[in-house]
């Protein structure tokens, strides 16, 4: 059996299948590695596009698991980044394995907006709450922000009334309809006994990526009384 000290320069295998997944702007790098007689450790480095004198920054150093959260090392979520991973076994290191280009805003997933529905006088009020995401470790909403290109530009709101569906588009930049917490849609209540079911999804600026669609929430109006 070969000892680690005897391994040749290229005998530490390179990690494989370096991929990045992001949910709610929280990107995590994953990779695969073959089983070794000695436990390997990994170093993960990130390079952001569009940063002056962009260089590889350490994100995780000498870790034994096969994933690394790089959310603290992402600049503008609209910009591209690359990741590379190397393995170390004893005193020897592998070559780097590099990821594909990844932009958190373009390639990641964002969860659905939350919905609230209620009756106010002669109308149904629908509140669409912006999804919460994590940017540089801080929780914030993906509402309109002129300082970044990664924000929800429009909500598609789907309203089913007694079987027929109507789609509304809400532009988030319009302050009368939206603020930094939510957007609001008002629909007249018909005089008939009616059920209103609502779901919504956001559309991100620039790439037109859609968030996950919310679960449908419903309200039934019985002669001016409400059943949620």
């Amino acid at each position: 059996e070969m000892g680690t000290a005897d391994l040749g320069p290229s005998s530490v295998p390179t990690p494989t299948n370096v991929t990045i997944e992001s949910y709610n702007m929280n990107p995590i790098v994953y990779w695969e590695y073959q089983i070794m007689p000695q436990v390997p450790v990994f170093t993960v480095e990130v390079k952001n596009y569009g940063v002056k004198n962009s260089e590889w920054i350490d994100a995780c150093i000498n870790i034994s698991h096969h994933y690394c959260n790089i959310s603290d090392h992402v600049g503008d979520p609209s910009n591209s980044l690359w990741v590379r991973v190397k393995a170390r076994v004893g005193q020897k290191e592998s070559a780097y394995a590099k990821s594909e280009e990844f932009a958190v805003c373009r390639d990641g997933k964002i969860g659905p907006p939350k919905l609230d529905i209620r009756k106010e006088e002669k109308q149904i009020m629908i509140d669409i709450f912006h999804p919460s995401v994590f940017v540089n470790g801080d929780e914030q909403e993906v509402d309109y922000d002129p300082e970044t290109t990664c924000y929800i530009r429009v909500y598609n709101v789907y309203v089913r009334m007694n079987g027929s569906e109507i789609q509304y588009k809400i532009l988030t930049q319009k302050e009368d309809d939206c603020d930094e917490i939510q957007c609001q849609l008002a629909i007249p209540v018909s005089s008939l006994n009616s059920q209103y079911c609502v779901s919504a999804e956001g559309v991100l600026h620039v790439w037109g990526v859609t968030t996950e669609k919310s679960k449908e929430v419903c309200i039934t109006i019985f002669n001016s009384s409400i059943k949620g």
């Epitope: 002669k122 109308q123 149904i124 109507i166 509304y168 588009k169 809400i170 532009l171 930049q173 319009k174 302050e175 009368d176 309809d177 939206c178 609001q184 849609l185 008002a186 629909i187 007249p188 018909s190 005089s191």
Partner: nanobody
């Protein structure tokens, strides 16, 4: 109380474009959600599009989605309907309607005030 006057209708060939305008009297135009409806000869009145008070929220009938665009200019007390790629089945009298408050209706009964209408004829 608000009075609505439509204009911009006429005869156009299939595939052509028209822009309808609806001007409201009074100084409280921004209080009203606005809608466009149409009625073809011998048919029921049909919802076309609606727009919120600020202009930030819109909705369209499936039959016109991607071809028609509703917009408004609150400074001019006017709501517009830009109609592109017109089809013969778009031939109808087009009415604009106003509803006091934020609620955006898709039924005629949702609206409080109506214009007299403008005729759009699309020929083949």
């Amino acid at each position: 109380q608000v009075q609505l006057v439509e204009s911009g209708g006429g005869l156009v060939q299939a595939g052509g474009s028209l822009r309808l305008s609806c001007t409201a009297s009074g100084r409280t135009f921004s209080r009203y959600a606005m809608g466009w409806f149409r009625q073809a000869p011998g048919k029921e009145r049909e919802f076309v599009a609606t727009i919120s008070r600020s202009g930030g929220t819109t909705s369209y009938a499936n039959s016109v989605k991607g071809r028609f665009t509703i917009s408004r200019d609150n400074a001019k007390n006017t709501v517009y309907l830009q109609m592109n790629s017109l089809k013969t089945e778009d031939t109808a009298v087009y009415n604009c309607a106003a509803r006091d408050g934020p609620a955006m209706g898709v039924f005629g009964s949702d609206y409080d005030y109506w214009g007299q209408g403008t005729l759009v004829t699309v020929s083949s």
